[in-house]
Every structure is written in structure tokens, then in C-alpha cells.
């Protein structure tokens, strides 16, 4: 008799895109429509929830733009929450100062990506300093990870 078919394990991967109705931090993400992937990872209230310990590549890109540059400091962070830790742990952070000419139209992207050892029940989020300056187009602002 033929051996039973191998049970294929779901690849743990997520790619979420910008959601323009984000009103507060952490950023909220589109998890259903468009170029979205969500497999073996849960999405809950702005966060990606890990359900298996291991090494993961985590990434996020945020596209900032404005019309009359005031050079407000911009920050883009990916951070983690876990019931074991009393406070948020910043995993990656990008900062921009003096990035445009006063009064001019401008646009800047911030990309963060690195490998982390994540534990089951870790929650990952993205924070920005100036929500009003984020362009939420799905190709411009996104958040994701995949298990190595």
C-alpha cells in the first residue's frame, strides 16, 4: 500500500499593507484585500502574533510625504510586546531629521528589516511619529515577516 501523503506544513508568512483609516498607534494594516499574505501567523489589532518559536525575517516600509515641509522629526519603529516583558521592546527603528527643504513638497521612505529569534505569543507592531504624513498605498507602506 502507498504511504500516507505527507502532511504539508503551512509556511509561516505575512505581508500586510497600509490601511488609510489608521487613526492611532500602533498602525493598523489591511489583512484581507489586495496583495496581502497571512499564513500560519495571526493578525490582531494592528499586530502580527507569532505562534511558533524560531528565526524570522521581519520587515516594514513606511512612505512619508508632505506638501509644505516643516521638517517635523519622523520616526518609524517595529516593536514587540510579550506578556513576559513589562514594556515594549523596540526591534528596529528609523529616524529622519532635516530631510526636506522648508515649504517644499517632499517624500521619503523608511525601510526596516532584520532577522529575529521570536517566541510563540510575541506580538509585533509598527509605530510612526507623524501619522498624518503617511501615504498608505499598498505598494508604499507595508509590514511583514516570514519564518526562516
Amino acid at each position: 500500500p502507498s504511504p500516507p501523503p505527507e502532511k504539508k506544513e503551512l509556511r509561516k508568512v505575512a505581508h500586510l499593507t497600509g490601511k488609510s483609516n489608521s487613526r492611532s498607534m500602533p498602525l493598523e494594516w489591511e489583512d484581507t484585500y489586495g496583495i496581502v499574505l497571512l499564513s500560519g501567523v495571526k493578525y490582531k489589532k494592528g499586530g502580527l502574533v507569532i505562534n511558533e518559536t524560531g528565526l524570522y525575517f521581519v520587515y516594514s516600509k513606511v512612505y512619508f510625504r508632505g506638501q509644505s515641509c516643516n521638517n517635523l522629526p519622523l520616526s518609524h519603529k517595529v516593536y514587540m510586546r510579550n506578556s513576559k516583558y513589562p514594556q515594549d521592546l523596540v526591534m528596529m527603528e528609523g529616524k529622519m531629521m532635516s530631510y526636506c527643504t522648508t515649504g517644499q513638497m517632499w517624500a521619503r521612505s523608511s525601510y526596516l528589516g532584520a532577522v529575529f529569534n521570536l517566541t510563540s505569543a510575541d506580538h509585533l507592531y509598527v509605530n510612526v511619529s507623524e501619522l498624518s504624513l503617511v501615504n498608505f498605498e499598498e505598494s508604499q507602506t507595508f509590514f511583514g515577516l516570514y519564518k526562516l
Epitope: G66, Q67, S68, C69, N70, N71, L72, S98, T102, G103, Q104, M105, S132, L133
Partner: antibody, heavy 119, light 111 residues
């Protein structure tokens, strides 16, 4: 309520300088750039320049370089514009207006400051 | 600099009728899918008041009888039906690039 309160009318002699002010209230002053606009009978509305309320650096219309100097005092939420070496051509109403970086236009304007240059 | 040419310089419109004001830019004021054209209303002794931004978007609190249209270099402000309180001077302005520039203004009189 958002307000931009400008200083009062000025009657000045030719050749002197004048400094006018624009105090913002009812919003976070450092979130918006401040633009200055000149209105005269001869030239309608002319954009003078813009200042970053956060950093204090400015961009000027080439035509007003050397004529106008913009500054900002974050502690008092006030923007200033000094006009130098005044001539009768500078007689006009000067407006300040705020511009949200995430928007398209100057959404709130001061009431205007009338500057009259006369000997 | 982008030159903004407004027409007509003045017009008189009967109460309840349509007022149409045109503005032509010397080069396109479009960028990345948006038109950086704004319209302001100014009454004597008052500062300009924002009516329309990004060519066709009505500023909060402005009556729906005001509308804007156009893209590239040609833009239009329509007021319909015109009311007594609309007597004012109207200016177009581009915010596509510095220095920002304004049209010469159109004075609207209500007959």
C-alpha cells in the same frame, strides 16, 4: 478655535524697517508651516515665503530676498516678518497663513497687517 | 515661476444663476495624480478664505454651491446658484511648486 492674530497697522517713513507678528493659537503651532503673503492694489496677492515653525529655517520668493526676513519664536507660538529699507512699493497688507504639511492649501489666515510707507 | 491667468477680471451674475471663473496655469500643476490648485474667496476688509483645495475638494464648512474642476493647466470655479453673500473677489492659487503664485482675481458682482 484656530486663530492667527497679527500685529496692528504700521505707518512708517521710507528707508526704515518694520517687524510684524503673527501669533498662532487653538492648534499645535509647530505642526504647521507659516506662509506670508503680500496684497497690494498693483499686484494682487504675492507669496513672500514660508518658515518652518519647528526648525526655524525659511524659503523665500526670489523677489523678496533681501526685503523680507522671517523668524519664529516657538515658545510664544509667534512668527515674525521684518521688512527692510521700506519704500512706497512696500505699502500693502501683509497676511500670515498656516499650511498643514499633509494638506494642499493655506487653510487659516491672519486678519492682515497694513503697512503704509510715507514721508 | 508658474503664471496663473484668471478670467474674467470681473463679472456680474443674477441671483440664482451660475457664475463661472476660469484659471489657466503656464505649466501643469499636476503631480502624482493630484492637481495642486486652490480657490480662495476674499471680501473687502477680510483675509482670503479657502473654498476649494486640490482642484475639486470642498473645504470644510463651505456651501456645496461652490465646486471646482479641471486638471493640468485649466481649472474652473463654479458657483450655482449664486447668492447675495457670494459677492467677493475670487483667486486661484497653485501649490505645486515654490514660489506659490496667485491669479489676478475675479470680482463677482450680484445683479
Amino acid at each position: 478655535e484656530v486663530q492667527l492674530q497679527q500685529s496692528g497697522a504700521e505707518l512708517v517713513r521710507p528707508g526704515v524697517s518694520v517687524k510684524i507678528s503673527c501669533k498662532g493659537s487653538g492648534y499645535t503651532f509647530t505642526d504647521y508651516t507659516i506662509h506670508w503673503v503680500k496684497q497690494s492694489h498693483a499686484k494682487s496677492l504675492e507669496w513672500i515665503g514660508v518658515i518652518s515653525t519647528y526648525q526655524g529655517d525659511a524659503s523665500y520668493n526670489q523677489k523678496f530676498k533681501g526685503k523680507a526676513t522671517m523668524t519664529v519664536d516657538k515658545s510664544s507660538s509667534t512668527a515674525y516678518m521684518e521688512l527692510a529699507r521700506l519704500t512706497s512699493e512696500d505699502s500693502a497688507i501683509y497676511y500670515c497663513a498656516r499650511f498643514p504639511d499633509w494638506d494642499y492649501a493655506m487653510d487659516y489666515w491672519g486678519q492682515g497687517t497694513s503697512v503704509t510707507v510715507s514721508s | 515661476d508658474i503664471v496663473m491667468t484668471q478670467s474674467p477680471a470681473s463679472l456680474a451674475v443674477s441671483l440664482g444663476q451660475r457664475a463661472t471663473i476660469s484659471c489657466k496655469a503656464s505649466q501643469s500643476v499636476d503631480y502624482d495624480g493630484d492637481s495642486y490648485m486652490n480657490w480662495y474667496q476674499q471680501k473687502p476688509g477680510q483675509p482670503p478664505k479657502l473654498l476649494i483645495y486640490a482642484a475639486s475638494n470642498l473645504e470644510s464648512g463651505i456651501p456645496a454651491r461652490f465646486s471646482g474642476s479641471g486638471s493640468g493647466t485649466d481649472f474652473t470655479l463654479n458657483i450655482h446658484p449664486v447668492e447675495e453673500e457670494d459677492a467677493a473677489t475670487y483667486y486661484c492659487q497653485q501649490s505645486r511648486e515654490l514660489p506659490y503664485t496667485f491669479g489676478g482675481g475675479t470680482k463677482l458682482e450680484i445683479k
